[in-house]
Interface confidence: low
């Protein structure tokens, strides 16, 4: 049989951040290679990562076509000796389908992790500070341009700002559904800032990790009386 000694893939896992999406699985191949297929619930299967010895496959190009669709992937285990026969065929020399394992369903819009945000700048004018969050580019395209996280999520995406006096540990918070905060500060005090991306309407993966802390008196800041 053409599928003798092949081991079905297992632990199929989606790893996705800001729509950069990779399917991972086990085990590392010994006498076999892998081919991955992906489809939407109603679509046709499309093959990716032909005859790979990797245990991961970057499926970003497929899922960004419509991030609101639900996708399913499957990983075929192809006997090593059959992998070089036909051009891009999954079937062994006897024509049988190699063993495969299905992934969990994956809906990028609802499940992709929010990447760690970055504070782009902060500017103090008197007792007010304007903090700007970098609008990170995704790999989702429209009209041949890459959309930002804000473009894709619209009002579903908010940012939470944590800020505190450098001399104390008491944190305050502010929220915005844009990429800017305007907060009141005490004159003459230095403050530190950290932001977090949040999608309140989600049930899973609602929050990003906190951004790196930025403090007044560092390069990103600007002060004007």
């Amino acid at each position: 049989s053409g599928t003798t000694n092949t081991v079905a893939a297992y632990n199929l896992t989606w790893k996705s951040t800001n729509f950069k999406t990779i399917l991972e699985w086990e085990p590392k191949p010994v006498n076999q290679v892998y081919t991955v297929q992906i489809s939407t619930k109603s679509g046709d299967w499309k093959s990716k990562c032909f005859y790979t010895t990797d245990t991961e496959c970057d499926l970003t190009d497929e899922i960004v076509k419509d991030v609101k669709q639900t996708y399913l992937a499957r990983v075929f285990s192809v006997p090593w000796r059959n992998s070089t026969h036909g051009k891009e065929t999954l079937f062994g020399t006897h024509g049988e389908e190699p063993p495969y394992e299905n992934s969990p369903e994956f809906t990028p819009y609802l499940e992709t992790n929010l990447g760690q945000p970055t504070i782009q700048s902060f500017e103090q004018v008197g007792t007010k500070v304007n903090v700007t969050v970098e609008d990170e580019r995704t790999l989702v395209r429209r009209n041949n341009t890459f959309l930002s996280l804000r473009d894709v999520f619209g009002k579903d995406l908010i940012y939470t700002l944590y800020y505190w006096k450098s001399s104390s540990s008491g944190k305050k918070t502010a929220k915005t559904n844009t990429n800017e905060f305007l907060i009141d500060v005490d004159k003459g005090e230095n403050y530190c800032f950290s932001v977090q991306a949040v999608i309140p309407s989600r049930t899973v993966n609602r929050k990003s990790t906190d951004s790196p802390v930025e403090c007044m008196g560092q390069e990103k800041g600007e002060f004007r009386e």
């Epitope: 960004v64 989702v140 429209r142 959309l147 473009d151 894709v152 619209g154 009002k155 844009t178 309140p200």
Partner: antibody
Framework: QVQLQESGPGLVKPSQTLSLTCTVS?????????WSWIRQHPGKGLEWIGE???????RYNPSLKSRVTISVDTSKNQFSLKLSSVTAADTAVYYC??????????????????WGKGTTVTVSS | EIVLTQSPGTLSLSPGERATLSCRAS???????LAWYQQKPGQAPRLLIY???SRATGIPDRFSGSGSGTDFTLTISRLEPEDFAVYYC?????????FGGGTKVEIK
């Protein structure tokens, strides 16, 4: 075809709480839209009060935030507005509206495509 | 708060004429969030244009929108009798969502 209908008392006494309900018919309130309240003072322009997502997350106009509560009841397909400590300045026509996220080619457009007919609320003793 | 300034306040024109209404924002607005509405006396506003330039369902093609950033325009190519009304622009991207003060298009 989705329709919205505002209901509630047309007369409210000063310092009391104005309470209005918007009933959604012809569609589900849980279908992924935002639901807004807007008001229009007599002979004036339009003022956005706030909005709610079916999950319960809200956004309010900062100028009214301390007095406004918007809530949703998905079982009744309704959302509601409460405005506390009203004065004569809150006399207006109150509209509810659907704020639709239209998803196209990877991103969103937003607009208020369905409106209720409006209900007049007068604040007077 | 993003302030939307509409001009002119009143536009006096005859049926068949072209109407050009302006909406200027105090800061840049993504076209995804810019809409135009028509309101007639005693009625709720009616969506005309969304995304700055896309016509809503059922809106005649004599209505068109254009612009980006801080300057947006609503054009009615040939005014019909039913087009005389008040027109509002609106942004729904930045809280608080705001409307322009309106432009009244009246019969000359």
């Amino acid at each position: 075809q989705v329709q919205l209908q505002e209901s509630g008392p047309g007369l409210v006494k000063p310092s009391q709480t104005l309470s209005l309900t918007c009933t959604v018919s012809g569609g589900s309130i849980s279908s992924g839209q935002y639901w807004s309240w807007i008001r229009q003072h007599p002979g004036k322009g339009l003022e956005w009060i706030g909005e709610i997502y079916y999950s319960g997350s809200t956004r309010y106009n900062p100028s009214l935030k301390s007095r406004v509560t918007i809530s949703v009841d998905t079982s009744k397909n309704q959302f509601s507005l409460k405005l506390s400590s009203v004065t004569a300045a809150d006399t207006a026509v109150y509209y509810c509206a659907r704020d639709t996220p239209y998803y196209y080619d990877g991103g969103y457009y937003y607009y208020m495509d369905v409106w209720g007919k409006g209900t007049t609320v007068t604040v007077s003793s | 708060e993003i302030v939307l300034t509409q001009s002119p306040g009143t536009l006096s024109l005859s049926p068949g004429e072209r109407a050009t209404l302006s909406c200027r924002a105090s800061q840049s607005v993504s076209s995804s969030y810019l809409a135009w509405y028509q309101q007639k006396p005693g009625q709720a506003p009616r969506l005309l244009i969304y995304g700055a330039s896309s016509r809503a369902t059922g809106i005649p093609d004599r209505f068109s929108g254009s612009g980006s950033g801080t300057d947006f325009t609503l054009t009615i190519s040939r005014l019909e009798p039913e087009d005389f009304a008040v027109y509002y622009c609106q942004q729904v991207g930045v809280v608080p969502y705001t409307f322009g003060g309106g432009t009244k298009v009246e019969i000359k």
